[in-house]
């Protein structure tokens, strides 16, 4: 997937340790975040979205399809 600039406004706080889910909202400065394809074991992790692997954290994260949100894109956005 290459490199993406991720900001707290769109992706929550950036966390550093392997295994951590980054779902907080602590403001951080813009940071360059590296992604790769998700390991095969996370094939079904993102319910309504695309999986990518956050290299710094060594965890999967989801890019949700329009109309969905949540860590796994499991929730429907009723206002969409």
């Amino acid at each position: 997937d290459g490199n993406t600039t991720r900001t707290p406004e769109t992706n929550g706080s950036l966390c550093g340790a392997p295994g951590e889910n980054c779902t907080g909202t602590t403001p951080r400065q813009k940071s360059k975040t590296h992604f790769s394809r998700c390991p095969k074991q996370y094939k079904h992790y993102c319910i309504h979205g695309r999986c990518r692997f956050v290299m710094d954290e060594q965890t999967p994260s989801c890019i949700c399809e329009k109309g969905y949100f949540g860590a796994r894109c499991e929730q429907v956005d009723l206002f969409y």
């Epitope: 966390c15 340790a17 392997p18 295994g19 951590e20 889910n21 980054c22 779902t23 907080g24 790769s36 394809r37 390991p39 095969k40 074991q41 079904h44 992790y45 290299m55 060594q58 965890t59 860590a71 796994r72 499991e74």
Partner: antibody, heavy 116, light 106 residues
Framework: QVQLLESGGGLVQPGGSLRLSCAAS????????ISWVRQAPGKGLEWVSY????????NYADSVKGRFTISRDNSKNTLYLQMNSLRAEDTAVYYC?????????WGQGTLVTVSS | DIQMTQSPSSLSASVGDRVTITCRAS??????LGWYQQKPGKAPKLLIY???SLQSGVPSRFSGSGSGTDFTLTISSLQPEDFATYYC????????FGQGTKVEIK
Amino acid sequence: QVQLLESGGGLVQPGGSLRLSCAASGFTFSRYWISWVRQAPGKGLEWVSYIDSTGTFINYADSVKGRFTISRDNSKNTLYLQMNSLRAEDTAVYYCARGGSLFDYWGQGTLVTVSS
Amino acid sequence: DIQMTQSPSSLSASVGDRVTITCRASQGIISYLGWYQQKPGKAPKLLIYAASSLQSGVPSRFSGSGSGTDFTLTISSLQPEDFATYYCQQYDALNTFGQGTKVEIK
């Protein structure tokens, strides 16, 4: 500092059940994936199961699928492993470890012995 | 399932030696590989993740390399505290460990 403390191990007969617990402290438990990894006496490491931070995404090793159930209570900072239909080959030290893909902190382990 | 094969199973070395342990995956795992150190009666310790990234707090004499199916852990100058068993672990498909390599004192 990060601490993981397993409990609940012991001697159980084949076919029996046991529930392991792992109490976590020193980090925001609800933000991390957590796993169980086991090690039979004198043998290597075997990953058993993991659960994601919300408790909605779970995977198991084929060797325990259908017999073991992983769960977590984020309000209690505790991970669980319910082990049913235990076999002699389940005898091992069971570790809880922080992470789903990689394991950066481990508990000291709890010994489960399955024997008649 | 992806099988991880480590070699050698054991090795004898002296303090100051350069030690290399290899790990081969039965299919390509990109760089989804970690290395752990375990001492008798203790829990494993993560040394390397993503094949070559050094875990925080781990001495720089440890290094990892490789991608695809062939990976290497190198200890540039063996120290007394490094005598232990080392495991590789893949995390592309469901997590599996190698059988371990025991590093003993010569």
